[in-house]
């Protein structure tokens, strides 16, 4: 798929979305921490 999202199976799609959500939360937290430290 051109958008890089695995859609052959719903459960794999959901797992990938969960990982993306988790990474976004972690990276967002790190970014906020960096801004705070400045």
């Amino acid at each position: 798929h051109s958008d890089g999202i695995f859609t052959d199976s719903y459960s794999r799609y959901r797992k990938q979305m969960a990982v993306k959500k988790y990474l976004a939360a972690v990276l967002g937290k790190r970014y906020k921490q960096r801004v705070k430290n400045k």
């Epitope: 859609t7 052959d8 799609y13 959901r14 959500k21």
Partner: antibody, heavy 121, light 111 residues
């Protein structure tokens, strides 16, 4: 209160088409993936289709692929199932169901009361 | 397709006793640490009701007398102590692999 109400079922001849709808209320419809599941007269449950919250992705079993199309209108909080080339084995009670929103995929936490589809000549 | 075989097809349990329902999959329904197994309860004239997701997680509002266990290919639904209102048909469902499939159901009667 979460509510799902199906409509549009009826009697259709083999080879015919039918579009059933599911009106959703009581939750942020566009945030939830949705499914159609049918129950045969013998009480067997069959998964029919699933669509993501935004409507970008859909999944079907081979038994209905190319004949059934799941879609949604998030502005109207409505889920659809367009059925064509209907066969006698498609006779069932058709339920719309909400996916539970957890990272655990495939569990359906709210179901409508169903709409009956009979395929017979 | 993954075939789910439920046993027994029906059982009668005395009030207050334990009901045990088995669901065996033709291949593993586990993926990346999760078991994609769900249990539903259905009473006559009603749609299925979610009881347990991810093999052992109780859905909100479901009494603690319901519990689910298992991984891989063998899963169990336990109800203890059984109450009158638990008379229903119970279905397992896997969503690890498309197509999602359901077991044939187990009818529970309360004695």
């Amino acid at each position: 209160d979460v509510k799902l109400v199906e409509s549009g079922g009826g009697l259709v001849k083999p080879g015919g088409s039918l579009k059933v709808s599911c009106a959703a209320s009581g939750f942020a419809f566009n945030n939830y993936d949705m499914s159609w599941v049918r129950q045969t007269p013998e009480k067997r449950l069959d998964w029919v289709a699933t669509i993501t919250g935004g409507g970008s992705y859909t999944w079907y079993p081979d038994s209905v692929k190319g004949r059934f199309t799941i879609s949604r209108d998030n502005a109207r909080n409505t889920l659809f199932l367009q059925m064509s080339s209907l066969r006698s084995e498609d006779t069932a009670l058709y339920y719309c169901a909400r996916l539970n929103g957890y990272d655990q995929a495939g569990a359906m936490d709210y179901w409508g009361q169903g709409t009956s589809v009979t395929v017979s000549s | 397709d993954i075939v789910l075989t439920q046993s027994p097809a029906s059982l009668a349990v005395s009030l207050g006793q334990r009901a045990t329902i088995s669901c065996k999959a033709s291949q593993s329904v586990d993926y990346d640490g999760d078991s994609y197994m769900t249990w539903y309860q259905q009473k006559p004239g009603q749609p299925p009701k979610l009881l347990i997701y991810a093999a052992s997680n109780l859905d909100s509002g479901i009494p603690a007398r319901f519990s689910g266990s298992g991984s891989g290919t063998d899963f169990t639904l336990n109800i203890h102590p059984v109450e009158e209102e638990d008379a229903a048909t119970y279905y397992c469902q896997q969503s690890n692999e498309d197509p999602w499939t359901f077991g044939g159901g187990t009818k529970l009667e309360i004695k």
